[in-house]
């Protein structure tokens, strides 16, 4: 039961995270005009990965797409790439994890297959989250660098008479959405990997073979099983399957701690 809960929760957390990564990637407010310690303007500028916008105090908003590919900064292209890779990996991870969910039965899919799929999706979520966090962090670093550069020459005077105010940009809402979403996807991926450990059989299951030694009735089970005497040392009720023995509540035997974010 704990494994199912961990897997389900991991899936939900990752789903929220990936939705957040998609939202952040599409958002226009990656960088917003810095209003602190600046003259109050009747125009507010903000920029995204795909277009830049201007909102006038009149309420009129105009957005312009970056219709060039080669003319864009390499860093912006890198951020775009990281976010898209994150989305693609996350989407594939979600698709894989749906089939891996223990609560969903697909034909006669074995637990080992589900475990492998859970691990695969978990790794995909981790990489997806890391891509998003990296993308957002690269953009944030770019902003910080530009911010201090524009602060250094905030006012470029023309003969000391006319001044040009340089627009400085600071962190936009999309950065925070991206960081949180990337973190959630990462946590979801870790939870999926933890759930995978619970789904995977810890031992190679063979048919039990009995060897009769003189004076003792000891059943030897190859493949890492502890040898157990036939007398009361294991009181758990067991169901014998073709592939070996497994306790009914073995599935629940892995304690898990969940971070609810």
């Amino acid at each position: 039961m704990a494994v199912t809960a961990c897997q389900g929760l991991g899936f939900v957390v990752s789903l929220i995270g990936i939705a957040g990564i998609i939202a952040a990637t599409c958002m226009d407010q990656w960088s917003t005009q810095d209003l602190y310690n600046n003259p109050v303007t009747a125009v507010f500028n903000y920029q995204g990965l795909w277009r830049s916008c201007v909102r006038e105090s009149s309420g009129f908003t105009e957005c312009r797409g970056y219709f060039t590919l080669l003319g864009l900064p390499a860093m912006l292209q890198a951020v775009r790439a990281l976010m898209i890779v994150g989305i693609v990996l996350g989407a594939i991870g979600l698709l894989v994890s749906i089939f891996a969910l223990k609560c969903i039965r697909i034909g006669s899919m074995e637990d080992s297959a589900k475990a492998n799929m859970t691990l695969t999706s978990g790794i995909m979520f981790i990489v997806s989250g890391l891509c998003a966090i990296a993308g957002v962090s690269v953009f944030a670093n770019m902003l910080v660098t530009n911010f201090w550069m524009s602060t250094a020459n905030m006012y470029t005077g023309m003969g000391g008479m006319v001044q040009t105010v340089q627009t400085r940009y600071t962190f936009g809402a999309a950065l925070f959405v991206g960081w949180v979403a990337g973190g959630l996807t990462l946590i979801g991926g870790v939870m999926m990997c933890i759930a995978c450990r619970g789904l995977a059989p810890e031992e190679t299951n063979y048919k039990a073979v009995s060897y009769h030694a003189s004076g003792h009735s000891v059943a030897y089970k190859p493949g890492g099983f502890k040898a157990s005497t036939g007398f009361g040392s294991n009181t758990k009720n067991k169901k014998i399957y073709d592939g070996g023995a497994r306790t009914e509540d073995e599935v629940q035997s892995y304690p898990s701690k969940h971070d609810y974010v």
């Epitope: 005009q33 003259p39 109050v40 303007t41 009747a42 125009v43 500028n45 920029q47 830049s52 916008c53 201007v54 006038e56 105090s57 009149s58 309420g59 009129f60 105009e62 312009r64 006319v162 001044q163 040009t164 105010v165 340089q166 627009t167």
Partner: antibody, heavy 118, light 113 residues
Amino acid sequence: QVQLQESGPGLVRPSQTLSLTCTASGFTFSKYAMNWVRQPPGRGLEWVAFISNGGSYTEYNPSVKGRFTILRDNSKNQLSLRLSSVTAADTAVYYCARHDKGNALDYWGQGSLVTVSS
Amino acid sequence: DIQMTQSPSSLSASVGDRVTITCKSSQSLLNSGNQKNYLTWYQQKPGKAPKLLIYWASNLQTGVPSRFSGSGSGTDFTFTISSLQPEDIATYYCQNDYFYPLTFGQGTKVEIK
């Protein structure tokens, strides 16, 4: 068609408080930011105050800040300007104007003369 | 506050003449975000409310005759009436629409010779 109509008391004593009202018609009032601009007799135009379409954001000319208050009631299609502690320097024709694209004031009322005199 | 300096303060021209008014701002009115200049031109006839002619320094307001035009960028702007008509007798104002407080030029009074 777009119409803006200002109304006010006309004559007030120094240090008194008065209110100017601008009633809008012919457009969706709640979608537009609004302004008050004044013009002292025989002088140029002076921007007074701005209010966003929802009424949450306001800006004032430093010369009137703290004394004047701009308000709007979108349900009544009304813009108002409350003038307190008025002086002779506040004597002017007060115009309400609609804020549009380019932050330009595209429609103006006919103006309301406020005379501050004892 | 941003200072808007208009010149000349008044001018007299004949019907059909080309009239040019200049406006200089103490800070650039060019917004880097959309590369637009937030400068507006208004016409005010005696006893009337001002009328919007040009916004974004060069965009003609709907319904305004094409003889009116605006140009310039940053801090220096020009307003032109290509062929002065009798109905153009008015005072013309430029306005900074970029920085608060929004400020007007002192006005240019146009008269007919």
